[in-house]
């Protein structure tokens, strides 16, 4: 067991020319944090995959307000050292991601906002108990430097932070078979401890906690011998004697995932499946706790009140991910109401209404017709986030204020004069059409295309259209 | 934990005033909008007013429009309600609720306990 | 305004019973549409946003279903602790508004 250590020394443009902008300005003031994501080996693994070793958020720096015309400098960095334990041994080898996050502490609609600013990635060898390594890394026009280490924790000594000491228990010398623990010469290497139960006889370890069976022997503990009755379970190498297959030990038996992590077999050995919240080989390893807000925009930490303990985040609406790290596309959840646009600045959300609606998303209808009088005994009609009024006869306009010109539509056909009544129009219809519109021929032999016309009324003469 | 207590309410006579107070914690009260919802004895819920984490956006029901104001002190973590000309059917269990994350959806996802206003002669 | 209408008014149903509840919009809310639990004396819970989304720390026996102007609020197997009145609220325009209620009670 151990932790692996991370100083941030700086984080601010790199040389060259294209400097960045600052990220912080007077309208958004914002503040920086870190992540360091730990995996084993010299993995190319996506950033989005599990850290297997470990991850650790620090703390959020200093509020930081970009000078106007000043160049960005390198910028105020959280205090204190990033640690993440694991309780495995030291790989040697190991990929590690870094992210620089900014926190915009700006009053903007929907509050501060979380956006990352940089992430840089490598692969480095090192050994536990080693001095600081230093390293400079640039993510685009971005310049971090850091150092980092990895100690073990006692009584863990060694590269691998697997050798056990113990103090003496003489003064003069370690027991049959031990060597004295360098560089602590006052203590002796320790035997390894095997997991508790493990048969002395039939059982052994090369890491602290587990227990290997030696062969004829399984269990979690070894103390079972293998069946030859039985050939149900085709795994082990032949049996001369039976003549079929005896099963040796499985690598998930007794499952070695902790902390409820599933196992599933490999063709070289096992592959723990992890609950949210462990790492490690074994699940072993919880490096992150509520204590280190590993909830990212505004989502809420519950349990995981020690590193033993699994953390869970409640992510707000619009996030998603084990951490809230991931901004759902909102724009795919039409937050804007009543056909608006929607526009996804990062930053923030906003909408484009339609002609009609107002408010952050659309969400306020300004036509409709509350409160809203049609005059001259016109009605209101409402629908789709428009208001219209439907007039009586003689008014028009939106809000049937205007007198209507009823010949302005100019109804009369066939040259037939309009004139304005005070109920309507009048047709006055030129020689040989009749109709209160002017729309009937008249014929020559007197007859119309229609009965003839009311008594009293010749064709030609006008007529009221009501 | 997030918790909103409400404060102020009280017997007042038709036509006269009083102020509802809100108070937030466990959650940062400047990234999210506030509504007052209330209830009268017996009866479903109504909204009554809103406003968004800034301040800049408020709306209120018809039914309280140009007598309720609503406010906010982001620096005082306090939500308030100025309600005038206070009439018998304003008579009702006042809560305070707080508003989704950016207002996406509109939704009262934490609610106070209510303070009780009786408008009664 | 937008008029929600919630029915049944009231259900008697018995534990372990699956429970629908409906709630019908005047007009087309989307996706616009939360569920709320109250009980006496208390003070309203959100249950479900956006139609069908569980709200942190809301068991998974609460469902929710629909879009457009009809949606459901499903129980799969009712515990003594989900005898309450349920009211569904329209986030799509405002003013919001809200059902009239649904008060479930024990058989």
């Known amino acids: 067991a151990g932790v692996f250590e991370l100083q941030i020394h700086s984080f601010g443009p790199g040389p060259g020319p294209g400097a960045p902008r600052s990220p912080c300005s007077a309208r958004l003031p914002c503040r920086l944090f870190f992540r360091v994501c730990l995996k084993p080996g010299l993995s190319e693994e996506a950033a989005e995959s599990p850290c297997a070793l470990g991850a650790a958020l620090s703390a959020r720096g200093p509020v930081y307000t970009e000078q106007p015309g000043a160049p960005a400098p390198d910028l105020p960095l959280p205090d204190g050292l990033l640690q993440v334990p694991f309780r495995d041994a030291w790989p040697g080898t190991f990929s590690f991601i870094i992210e620089t996050w900014r926190e915009e502490l700006g009053d903007q609609i929907g509050g501060p906002a979380w956006s990352l600013l940089a992430r840089v990635a490598g692969r480095r060898r090192l050994a536990a108990g080693g001095p600081w390594a230093r390293d400079i890394q640039r993510a685009g026009a971005w310049e971090l430097r850091f150092s980092y280490r990895a100690r073990c924790e006692p009584p863990a000594v060694g590269t691998a932070c697997t050798r056990l000491c113990r103090p003496r228990s003489a003064p003069s010398r370690c027991g049959p078979g031990l060597r004295p623990c360098a560089p602590l010469e006052d203590e002796c290497e320790a035997p390894l401890v095997c997991r508790a139960g493990c048969s002395p006889e039939h059982g052994f370890c090369e890491q602290p906690g587990e227990c290997r069976c030696l062969e004829g022997w399984t269990g979690p503990l070894c103390t079972v011998p293998v069946s030859t009755s039985s050939c149900l379970s085709p795994r082990g190498p032949s049996s001369a004697t039976t003549g079929c297959l005896v099963p040796g030990p499985g690598p998930c038996d007794g499952n070695p995932c902790a902390n409820g992590g599933s196992c599933s077999e490999t063709p070289r050995s096992f592959e723990c499946t992890c609950p949210r919240g462990f790492y490690g080989l074994r699940c072993e390893v919880s490096g992150v706790t509520c204590a280190d807000g590993p909830c990212f925009n505004g989502g809420l930490c519950v349990g995981g009140a020690d590193p033993d303990s699994a953390y869970i985040c409640h992510c707000p609406p619009g996030f998603q991910g084990s951490n809230c790290e991931k901004r759902v596309d909102r724009c795919s959840l039409q937050p804007c109401r009543n056909g608006g646009l929607c526009l996804d600045l990062g930053h923030a959300l906003r909408c484009r209404c339609r002609a009609g609606f107002a408010g952050p998303r659309c969400e306020h209808d300004l036509d409709d017709c509350a409160g809203r009088a049609c005059a001259n005994g016109g009605t209101c009609v409402e629908g789709g986030g428009a208001h219209r009024c439907s007039c009586a006869l003689g008014f028009g306009g939106r809000d049937c204020r205007e007198r209507a010109d009823p010949c302005a539509a100019r109804p009369c056909a066939h040259g037939g004069r309009c004139y304005a009544h005070f109920s309507g129009l009048v047709c006055a219809c030129a020689p040989g059409y009749m109709g209160a519109r002017c729309e009937f021929p008249v014929h020559p032999d007197g007859a119309s295309a229609l009965p003839a016309a009311p008594p009293g009324l010749r064709p030609g003469d006008p007529q009221r259209y009501l | 934990e997030v918790q909103l207590v409400e404060s102020g309410g009280g017997l007042v006579q038709p036509g006269g005033s009083l102020r509802l107070s809100c108070a937030a914690s466990g959650f940062t009260f400047s990234d999210y909008g506030i509504h007052w919802v209330r209830q009268a004895p017996g009866k479903g819920l109504e909204w009554v007013a809103y406003?968004?984490?800034?301040?800049?956006?408020?709306y209120y029901a018809d039914t309280v429009k140009g007598r309720f104001t609503i406010s906010r002190d982001n620096a005082k973590n306090s939500l308030y309600l100025q309600m005038n000309s206070l009439r018998a059917e304003d008579t009702a269990v006042y809560y305070c609720?707080?508003?989704?994350?950016?207002?996406?959806?509109?939704?009262?996802?934490?609610w106070g306990q209510g303070t009780t206003v009786t408008v009664s002669s | 305004d937008i008029q929600m209408t919630q029915s049944p008014s009231s259900l008697s149903a018995s534990v372990g019973d699956r429970v629908t509840i409906t709630c019908r919009a005047s007009r087309d809310i989307t996706k616009f549409l939360n569920w709320y639990q109250q009980k006496p004396g208390k003070a309203p819970k959100l249950l479900i946003y956006?139609?069908?989304r569980l709200h942190s720390g809301v068991p998974s026996r609460f469902s929710g279903s629909g879009s457009g102007t009809d949606f459901t609020l499903t129980i799969s197997s009712l515990q003594p602790e989900d005898f309450a009145t349920y009211y569904c609220q329209q986030g799509n325009t405002l003013p919001w508004t809200f059902g009239g209620g649904t008060k479930v009670e024990i058989k």
């Open positions: 956006y139609t069908s």
């Open positions: 406003i968004s984490s800034g301040g800049y956006t408020i």
């Open positions: 609720a707080r508003g989704d994350y950016e207002d996406i959806f509109y939704t009262m996802d934490y």
